[in-house]
């Protein structure tokens, strides 16, 4: 059965890091390229970033630019997110979801960012 | 880089037969193996993607199995308009995609 | 309708230049990784080059780079292969070819000539 | 940067048909996903490419893109299509992922 499953949220300060964690099963990791989407409280989707399935290649939303890295390891089929210089607004569920059709999503991590 | 093998390299058959064509990949690529068609100064056409999927509109008669490093296309009943040359092609190490060096069904 | 359209082809010397055109019609372009894949006289099939959709990502096989650039241009649904340095064994039909979601290359141009010769 | 607009609310009878629109400046030239997320759990691909459905997504669902306008029509709603209906698109200028707001759709 294809799977993602997302670890790594949790509570941290303004200012703070986290590195989330997607591990996946059921498919060829390597051939696919894998995304971040996230969901704010009560609000709709919004993209994070995204990476090529060799890993070489990356993409960020402007409002993460600079401040979050994604990186994956096809030997580990898994991928991360490291988040660093935690605002208040990056306060959300963190999904991570495969391919550029998002066709197969993990459960989500939740991520709260408050002092 | 991941290579490609297929077999036999030709075959004759006539129209009726079963036709049974292997690839072999020199590690694994999972499911992650398609079959293309090429007909004399055509284009490839794709038949089957992912191993055993037919492409909409390839005639039932092509079927694909295998996973791994040894895959198989097999056609149930060969037609008249199946004799071309056919290509296994992994799609693992996606995008730096790898063919096979083909193999020619011809009219026995 | 889908339709993959090359031109650019001919016969250029050794250590000559081409410009390989793909205009694509009948699909979301700017959707899809698009790529270039060769054949040589009498020969099987050889991936050479793929570019991402925003163009951003390039790939390219051994024995093309540094010789080869693949670019798009999304704005004229256009495919294009810059092919510098060329070699006797480059001669071949080359394909544009569509990449359906990681599944294989579902759609091919009719394939355009290129023949490196003295 | 591209935008993505949805109605926040489309309501329906049992049995009827919904239709949920995202509007975008020439969105017809793009590809759309559409995904629906019902309460507590994670978004599903309904439709890619403007018209494709994933395996296992009941005909029901279809989607259609032209113009300014890509809609996602649900025939023959049942109680539980109650959810939150989101579209995307890549803006291919910068190669970004834009999702419209979202359509919660209420099932009467």
């Known amino acids: 059965e294809v799977q993602l499953l997302e670890s790594g949220g949790g509570l941290v300060q303004p200012g703070g890091s986290l590195r989330l964690s997607c591990a996946a099963s059921g498919f060829t990791f390597s051939l696919y390229s894998m995304n971040w989407v996230r969901q704010a409280p009560g609000k709709g989707l919004e993209w994070v970033s995204s990476i090529y399935s060799s890993g070489g290649s990356t993409l960020y939303a402007d409002s993460v630019k600079g401040r979050f890295t994604i990186s994956r390891d096809n030997s580990k089929n898994t991928l991360y997110l490291q988040m660093n210089s935690l605002r208040a607004e990056d306060t959300a569920v963190y999904y991570c979801a495969r391919g550029r059709a998002f066709d197969i999503w993990g459960q989500g991590t939740m991520v709260t960012v408050s002092s | 880089d991941i290579q490609m093998t297929q077999s036999p390299s030709s075959l004759s058959a006539s129209v009726g037969d079963r036709v049974t064509i292997t690839c072999r990949a020199s590690q694994s690529v999972g499911t992650y193996l398609n079959w293309y068609q090429q007909k004399p100064g055509k284009a490839p056409k794709l038949l089957i993607y992912a191993t055993s999927n037919l492409r909409s509109g390839v005639p039932s008669r092509f079927s694909g199995s295998g996973s791994g490093t040894d895959f198989t296309l097999t056609i149930s009943s060969l037609q008249p308009e199946d004799f071309a040359t056919y290509y296994c092609q992994q799609s693992y190490s996606i995008p730096r995609f790898t063919f096979g060096p083909g193999t020619k069904v011809d009219i026995k | 309708e889908v339709q993959l359209l090359e031109s650019g082809g001919g016969l250029v010397q050794p250590g000559g230049s081409l410009r390989l055109s793909c205009a694509a019609s009948g699909f979301t372009f700017s959707d899809y990784d698009m790529h270039w894949v060769r054949q040589a006289p009498g020969k099987g099939l050889e991936w050479v080059s793929g570019i991402s959709p925003s163009g951003g990502w390039t790939w390219y096989a051994d024995s093309v780079k540094g010789r080869f650039t693949i670019s798009r241009d999304n704005s004229k649904n256009t495919l294009y292969l810059q092919m510098n340095s060329l070699r006797a064994e480059d001669t071949a039909v080359y394909y544009c070819?569509?990449?359906?979601?990681?599944?294989?290359?579902?759609?091919w141009g009719q394939g355009t000539l290129v023949t490196v010769s003295s | 940067q591209y935008e993505l607009t949805q109605p926040p609310s489309v309501s329906v009878a049992p049995g009827q048909t919904a239709r949920i629109i995202c509007g975008g400046n020439?969105?017809?030239?793009?590809?759309v996903h559409w995904y629906h997320q019902k309460a507590g759990q994670a978004p599903v691909l309904l439709v890619y490419d403007n018209t494709d459905r994933p395996s296992g997504i009941p005909e029901r669902f279809s989607g259609s893109n032209s113009g300014n306008t890509a809609a996602l029509t649900i025939t023959r709603v049942e109680a539980g299509d109650e959810a939150d209906y989101f579209c995307?698109?890549?803006?291919?200028?910068?190669?970004?992922?834009?999702f419209g707001g979202g359509t919660k759709l209420t099932v009467l």
């Open positions: 020439d969105i017809g030239s793009k590809g």
């Open positions: 070819a569509r990449d359906w979601y990681s599944s294989g290359l579902d759609y």
């Open positions: 995307q698109v890549w803006d291919s200028t910068g190669e970004h992922a834009v």
